[in-house]
């Protein structure tokens, strides 16, 4: 007989998730309507297809990015998609709520959806951390508190150091990774006898996973050109990050090769390193002026991707109890942290360069955006792993991690779990 | 030569609605940012809204909230700024503007580097 | 941010050395622009990014500072400049605030 949910729990998650759902429906009837002024079709098209490609990096790119373990390929696919599908919703009334309530109404645009969107996949970063660990109930939570901690923080640095839509999503980078990581300290660790096998990657899941990491590459250019306001910044951080990311593949495959005893390639740090350009160049892709520096950033940042990707994961499974494949996300805070060095310093040499001598006030500003990131993420992190950890959302045993007999219903499979 | 052009301003009671239209000429009008500025008789400057080139995403000073609304119309090179809910104090000269964006050393600038001649919005009873 | 200009109404003569003070509530870089607005007229840029000169602007105007201090100089007063002056905080998130203005009249 196959596997059931226990059954505190199938009474637990679509009660939880379909109140929820009822809510979000009820504050979309009362607080939000379609912006009418649409007078440029043509600009429509155009504007939608940046969501488009969003929507594809989120739902396909990271959901089949975490899907490489032998035992839990479904459930990584399919709780992404449950949690972009919750976190574009709850994002949208988010940032009206922040940023448009004084009218009353909160207008949807199609920028709105990309920005949701965009917070969205701050959540399907961190929980690469996460997944395999815990049920769809608790996933609820963590979506929640995460796009909420994520939307006021873009808030507040908007507010206080007046930096525009880019620069405060680019911290997502950053945010994503210490937020994914603290939730992980605070869950369960150890892995009983017998299962380790349970979280090892194997080869089907693994093609899928580097599938994932393809949508991803394909697209990076236009989600860190997203949100810049200017076609000219557009066109600059799409060729940058392009230039960026096809440098990090190169480094990421040889590097793989010289990082091994016998030279051989490791899928693992191919997944992750592939992306590695497009985080490092995220949030100054608008301002590097010439593709060279974009390719250096790249090499760099491939190269910090392997040797994390080699050196880090013992340290990272000890303390955190994130498995080897789960690397995005000690990946992506090292390779968001040379980002934002990378601004910084390109902001020193701009401020040099235009000779206004205020060069400690305005590393003092993203040093200050940077340090707020990383705060907020650690301590709603750390929140949100106490919250996960209460007993009411009959999270899976641990012997039960990593296993998607648990969550799904395999009609062939004669054996139960 | 960059020309703006400004119309449909006129006298409005209090609570009506009034749509004001920026012509654009001279220059490629789909790949800028603009802007709708207003000057209250006698009174300082005031940002009201702004449009991205692509008309993605608008914003708006917290005095027109839920008011008004900017678009475009990159086809026939037009800014338009619908004006419902009229209040006096909306009384002022609108203005039109566009955004270059200019590169300085690394970073990037911005400025309204065109104006329209303006168009009187008097809302009276 | 809030931006407030000093003085808000200053008598000169041609040929006078005259500044203007932009002061910023939050620090807002070098994205500063200042304009000149002459009587049922549009406002004209004469400076972006704090200090650089609008082409086709005469060079008697400048313009320093960076962060929340700016100052437009022009350094020989002439007929043509008797108007008034507004700083434009053009950082990057709206509200993009205009200063109140700084009026420039004869002596």
């Known amino acids: 007989m196959s596997s059931k949910y226990p059954r505190s729990v199938r009474r637990c998650l679509p009660l939880w998730a379909l109140t929820l759902e009822a809510a979000l429906i009820l504050l979309f009837y009362f607080f939000t309507h379609y912006d009418a002024s649409l007078e440029d079709q043509k600009g429509l098209v155009a504007s939608y297809q940046v969501g488009q490609d969003l929507t594809v990096m989120a739902a396909i790119g990271l959901g089949f990015l975490t899907s490489s373990f032998r035992r839990h390929s479904w459930s990584s696919v399919a709780f992404n998609l449950f949690m972009l599908a919750l976190g574009v919703q709850w994002a949208i009334l988010l940032d009206g709520f922040l940023s448009q309530f004084p009218s009353g109404k909160v207008v949807i645009t199609l920028f709105s959806i990309r920005l949701a969107t965009m917070s969205a996949l701050s959540v399907l970063i961190s929980v690469d951390a996460v997944l395999g660990k815990v049920n769809l109930a608790q996933l609820v939570v963590m979506v929640l508190v995460e796009v909420t901690a994520l939307g006021n923080l873009r808030m507040v640095i908007s507010n206080i150091f007046n930096t525009d839509y880019h620069m405060n999503m680019m911290h997502i980078y950053v945010f994503a990774a210490y937020f994914g990581l603290s939730v992980a300290w605070c869950l369960p660790k150890p892995l009983p006898e017998g299962t380790e096998d349970k979280d090892q990657t194997a080869t089907i899941p693994s093609l899928s996973a580097m599938l994932g990491a393809l949508f991803l590459w394909m697209f990076w250019p236009s989600f860190n050109s997203a949100l810049l306001r200017s076609p000219i910044e557009r066109k600059n951080a799409v060729f940058n990050t392009y230039y960026a990311v096809a440098v990090s593949v190169v480094t990421a495959i040889s590097g793989s090769s010289l990082a091994h005893p016998q030279g051989k390639i490791s899928k693992t740090y191919v997944h992750s390193a592939v992306l590695a350009g497009g985080v490092a160049v995220g949030t100054s892709c608008h301002l590097i002026p010439s593709p060279w520096l974009a390719m250096v950033l790249g090499l760099v940042a491939g190269l910090i991707s392997v040797g994390g990707a080699k050196y880090l994961p013992g340290c990272c499974n000890r303390v955190l109890g994130i498995p080897h494949s789960s690397i995005m996300g000690y990946n992506f805070s090292l390779l968001g942290l040379l980002g934002e060095i990378i601004y910084i310093v390109l902001l020193v040499l701009d401020t040099v360069g235009a000779g206004n001598g205020m060069i400690g006030f305005q590393v003092l500003l993203s040093i200050g955006e940077l340090s707020l990131a990383i705060v907020i993420a650690l301590m709603s992190g750390l929140l949100t792993g106490l919250l996960l950890n209460l007993k009411i959302w009959k999270a899976p045993h641990e012997a039960k991690y990593f296993d998607d007999q648990v969550f799904w219903k395999f009609p062939h499979l004669a054996v139960g779990f | 030569e960059v020309q703006l052009l400004e119309s449909g301003g006129g006298v409005v009671q209090p609570g009506r609605s009034l749509r004001l239209s920026c012509a654009a000429s001279g220059f490629t009008f789909s790949t800028y940012g603009m802007h709708w500025v207003r000057q209250a008789p006698g009174k300082g400057l005031e940002w009201v809204a702004v449009i991205w080139f692509d008309g993605s995403n608008k914003e708006y000073a917290d005095s027109v909230k839920g008011r008004f609304t900017v678009s475009r119309d990159n086809s026939k090179n037009t800014l338009y700024l619908q004006m419902n809910s009229l209040r006096a104090e909306d009384t002022a000269v609108y203005y039109c503007?566009?955004?270059?964006?200019?590169?300085?050393?690394?970073?990037?600038?911005?400025?309204?580097?065109?104006w329209g001649q303006g168009t009187l919005v008097t809302v009276s009873s | 941010a809030e931006l407030t200009q000093s003085p808000s109404f200053l008598s000169a003569s041609v040929g006078d050395r005259v500044t203007i003070t932009c002061r910023a509530s939050?620090?807002?870089?070098?994205?500063l622009a200042w304009y000149q607005q002459k009587p049922g007229k549009a406002p004209k840029l004469l400076i972006y990014a704090a200090s650089t000169l609008q082409s086709g602007v005469p060079s008697r105007f400048s313009g320093s500072g960076s962060g929340t201090e700016f100052t437009l100089t022009i350094a020989s007063l002439q007929p043509d400049d008797f108007a008034t002056y507004y700083c434009q905080q053009l950082n990057n998130y709206p509200p993009f605030t205009f200063g109140p203005g700084t009026k420039v009249d004869i002596k």
């Open positions: 939050q620090g807002i870089r070098s994205y």
């Open positions: 503007a566009r955004e270059e964006v200019v590169r300085g050393v690394i970073l990037w600038s911005r400025k309204f580097d065109y």
